[in-house]
């Protein structure tokens, strides 16, 4: 039997009677078809629930949606659909929920046959909607400025961007022939646009334009542009090299206004370039191999976005569906994980605690075998499922998951050998951040963090029978205990939680199905008289992040300083509550040559921590030159990496060289570029988010 | 009942050479780091240097760097600090100190102490 | 190095008084923070480790508070047998650092 499951285990008293008293049934009366949930606001207790059902008759598609809304966490619901005037809403499109706890809320409804589109906008956490027309249908989703709700952004199918500063009373449409747009920092928006008005054919020869006043004012930052992405500081543009179908990246970290070329691979038209993660400090950018591989390479970059170290080989990333099973766990700082293509075409996960300084392999979870993909049998790895598995139509209900108020928990779908496995997964935690792992549930889970990390719950995923069941554990998943939440089992589609994982509630959604008709039914559980009283001082203990070696004085030291946690005790059984704040205590750690990266014309030699300057700069690395302004090209071989703090230790000083004799490129000179160009170059092109994913940054 | 007892402290004089030793009894002394802690005498206390479980990690004060050795023999459940170039400064209270397992942890076992007088 | 810099230096405090004793360390040192008590001619012996978590057999009128760069040390009601030096040690970062002590003396 999985680990803890035992009866002696429970800690939990006479959980039945409270959690009982604690459940809450709603029916839905409608057809089953799709469910959209959104969370309005934060702690609100605000959910709308978006059911939608259509039918394909002929040519045309008739469908039907209900609205309901919920203000005690999705114990009851109530139909709204009057609000919304029984309108069809869009499904592809969701429910736009606002930044911040602005309890702003939009929904596009589908108007057929019209030359514009329908919206119904809430400001009020959804109690009341305005009905508005818009002159134009929107292609995407409506995006909210995100440090001003009341300022939206849209792109039409007919290209054309319009502008809201009123939360959509009003409408304007600032520029036509546009691709993609995207929001950048203080209300700036950029956009890629082509004169043609075509965006698919013509990728390459788009412009990248920006305004920072909402369409008063324009600047082109940019011109032969293939795509552009966001990525924390930095915005990225890979731009035609003027060598036939060959691209490369730019970078800027002024908004544009000037370019410095990335010392990255250029990328032919079948390959692709993908930011992985970003924020202020650094960007994982994943580069393509060439032809159908289906693997790339990981770089990370220096401060400044320019200077790129290879951080990991073989990389997976299907060029086809967009599969990359890259995660930033989020409970461990500089912790993530991702998957390889083996040489012999297996799938392995691998795990850097560095920020992508070293990859690794997941420790074996002790209280696990080796399954049959081990050579060795005292000798594996875990391996995790993630987007690639769940694209493969594998039985992995959830991706990985993590959250940074649940400090060094990982709760993952996984595999015990040298590569993933097609076989049945199972489910295992991490305590730490995934130095260490534990099978926590046998077979395939739904699974959610609630209470900050205080109470995990699951649902086991079985696809042919009904579900009645849901696990509950205090202790970090040591130990689970079984509460039946109805006599009458259900047809589990998934676990709801509020984003945050600060709530104690869950809900568990799913359907009934009777000879005539589906009806959609959810089980909401408040856990809060299991987790009977609030954490004390006591319930807390001192927990050093990333502690390998407690007997080495530089334990713990990850990116020039270590961390010590107040993290709750295994043992207690009490509410963190939702206005729990992470206690940290940073302490900075000496400076080694393990906190530097080798600066642009120099490189490591395997097993060795000195940067050596590279005999002489070949092929891209030429081209890099030219556009490095001089404060580029000077370097002692040493920079920081992003985000290190450390002091003190080794200072890894010497002769400063100026590079720039060594750049004898003519590459794209800037008096070739076209005179709307503002800088060296500029890029364009768009920002996935792979949702039932990750959310990757830039995906061209 | 858990111990350490030091031993080898005395008079030298000045540049000369002593080898202190500290015994240690009641617990697995080889899963723990040990410590040498001086204290001159009417002053405080001041760290002198550090040796892990297997010898992996040996970290010394500046200000005997170069000049003290520790060493220690699991076997023999034995921590050593070989003193050489004795200074004047150097005289102090000499005691042998266990620290906890823990990350960063405290020095919760100590010895009595044995006396270096450096004087020429 | 890290500095710790005790006060006071010194205390005469009537018994079943309650007596505080600060440490500022230079930098912060998370909870790497630990108390000690030498009695005249005695070896030193643990109170508080981590800041804030008694030793064991340690009287409960011994507790210890802070984070960071501030830490204090609490004798709820003070015993004759306290009378003795009190010392914070950290061992965050090396060299580790001993405060300059602080000297508790029965009224």
């Known amino acids: 039997s999985a680990p803890g499951e035992d009866e002696e285990c429970g800690r939990v008293r006479d959980f039945v009677a409270k959690l009982a008293n604690n459940t809450h049934q709603h029916v839905f009366d409608d057809l089953r078809g799709s469910v959209s949930l959104a969370w309005v606001g934060d702690g609100t207790g605000v959910i709308l629930a978006l059911t939608t059902f259509q039918v394909p008759i002929f040519m045309i598609t008739i469908g039907q949606s209900k609205l309901y809304r919920s203000e005690d966490y999705g114990k009851n619901f109530k139909d709204i659909t009057d609000l919304i005037n029984n309108t069809f809403i869009r499904s592809d499109f969701g429910i736009a929920i606002g930044p911040e706890n602005s309890g702003k809320v939009i929904l596009t409804a589908d108007v057929s046959g019209s030359h514009g589109s329908r919206i119904f906008r809430s400001s009020d956490f959804a109690k009341n909607f305005v009905q508005t027309d818009l002159p134009f249908v929107p292609l995407m989703q409506i995006t909210y400025n995100p440090e001003n709700s009341n300022v939206l952004l849209a792109l039409s199918n007919k290209n054309e961007l319009w502008v809201s500063k009123n939360f959509g009373g009003k409408w304007e449409e600032i520029h036509d022939t546009v691709c993609l747009a995207k929001w950048g920092r203080k209300g700036t928006i950029f956009f890629t646009a082509n004169h043609n008005g075509s965006c698919s054919n013509d990728r390459g020869m788009l412009e990248l334009w920006r305004t920072s006043d909402l369409g008063k004012s324009f600047k082109t930052i940019g011109v032969k542009i293939y795509s552009f992405g966001l990525g924390g500081k930095f915005l990225f543009a890979s731009v035609m090299t003027g060598k036939g179908t060959l691209r490369r990246i730019h970078v800027s970290t002024d908004q544009g206004d000037t370019w410095s070329m990335a010392q990255l691979p250029s990328v032919g038209h079948e390959q692709f370039y993908s930011i992985l993660a970003a924020n202020d400090e650094m960007v994982f950018m994943h580069v393509d191999e060439p032809g159908d591989s289906g693997f790339g390479t990981i770089f990370t970059s220096d401060d400044r976005g320019i200077v790129y170290s290879k951080s990991l080989d073989r990389h997976l990333y299907t060029t086809t569906g967009g599969e990359t099973d890259f995660i930033n766990v989020t409970s461990l700082r500089g912790v993530f994980t991702t998957s390889i293509l083996a040489e012999d075409k297996s799938i392995q996960t691998m795990i850097t605690f560095d920020q992508g300084g070293r990859w690794t392999h997941l420790r074996k979870p002790e209280n696990s075998e080796c399954d049959a993909t081990a050579k060795n049998k005292n000798e594996c790895s875990l391996h995790i499922h993630a987007a690639y598995s769940i694209a493969t139509g594998l039985n992995v209900p959830m991706l990985p998951l993590s959250e940074p108020n649940a400090v060094g928990l990982v709760l993952a779908h996984g595999s015990v050998g040298d590569a993933i496995s097609v076989m049945r997964p199972d489910v295992y935690i991490s305590d730490d951040g995934g130095y260490s792992w534990t099978k926590m549930l046998e077979g395939p889970h739904h699974y959610a963090i609630l209470d900050s990390g205080g109470l995990l719950v699951a649902v086991e995923q079985n696809a042919h029978q009904g579900v009645n069941v849901i696990k509950f554990s205090t202790d970090e998943g040591q130990c689970w205990q079984t509460y039946t939440f109805t006599r009458d089992p259900i047809f589990f589609t998934g676990l709801a939680s509020e984003p945050g994982a600060r709530s104690m509630n869950v809900s568990l959604w799913g359907y009934r199905s009777s000879l005539f008709h589906q009806q959609w039914v959810s089980y909401t559980i408040d856990f809060k008289d299991i987790l009977e009283r609030n954490c004390e001082e006591k319930d807390y203990t001192i927990w050093l992040a990333h502690s390998t070696d407690p007997e080495d004085y530089e334990d713990g030291c990850i990116l020039g300083y270590k961390e010590q946690f107040l993290r709750l005790r295994k043992s207690s059984v009490c509410q963190n509550g939702r206005d729990y704040v992470v206690t940290k205590q940073p302490s900075i750690c000496l400076c080694s040559l393990e906190d530097f990266l080798c600066d642009f014309g120099y490189y490591r030699p395997e097993n060795d921590s000195k940067c050596v300057e590279q005999p002489e700069l070949k092929g891209h690395d030429l081209e890099f030159c030219l556009y490095g302004r001089e404060e580029h090209l000077t370097t002692n071989g040493y920079r920081k990496i992003p985000g290190d703090k450390c002091q003190g230790g080794v200072n890894p000083v010497r002769e400063v060289k100026d590079l720039k004799k060594k750049c004898t490129s003519n590459f794209l000179s800037p008096e070739k570029q076209n005179s709307k160009s503002n800088g060296s170059a500029g890029g364009s092109g768009g920002l996935n988010d792979i949702f039932e994913a990750q959310k990757i940054e830039w995906h061209e | 009942e858990v111990q350490l007892v030091e031993s080898g402290g005395g008079l030298v004089k000045p540049g000369g050479s002593l080898r202190l030793s500290c015994a240690a009894s009641g617990f697995t002394f080889s899963s723990y780091s040990m410590n040498w802690v001086r204290q001159a005498p009417g002053k405080g206390l001041e760290w002198v240097s550090s040796?892990?479980?297997?010898?992996?990690?040996?970290y010394y004060a500046d200000s005997v760097k170069g000049r003290f050795t520790i060493s220690r023999d699991n076997a023999k459940n034995s921590l050593y600090l070989q003193m050489n170039s004795l200074r004047a400064e150097d005289t102090a209270v000499y005691y042998c100190?266990?620290?906890?397992?823990?990350?960063?942890?405290?020095?919760?076992?100590w010895g009595q102490g044995t006396m270096v007088t450096v004087s020429s | 190095e890290i500095v710790l810099t005790q006060s006071p230096d010194f205390q005469s405090v009537t018994p079943k008084e309650k007596v505080t004793i600060t440490c500022r360390a230079s930098?912060?040192?998370?909870?790497?923070l630990h108390w000690y008590q030498q009695k005249p001619d005695q070896s030193p012996k643990l109170l508080i480790k981590y800041a804030s978590q008694s030793f064991s057999g340690v009287p409960s009128r011994f507790s210890g508070s802070g984070s960071g760069t501030d830490f204090t040390l609490t004798i709820n009601s003070l015993e004759a047998e306290d009378a003795a030096a009190y010392y914070c040690?950290?061992?965050?970062?090396?060299?580790?650092?001993f405060g300059g002590g602080t000297k508790v003396e029965i009224k």
């Open positions: 040796i892990s479980s297997s010898s992996s990690y040996i």
């Open positions: 930098q912060s040192i998370g909870y790497s």
């Open positions: 100190a266990r620290r906890g397992s823990g990350s960063y942890d405290a020095f919760d076992i």
């Open positions: 040690h950290q061992s965050s970062s090396l060299p580790l650092t």
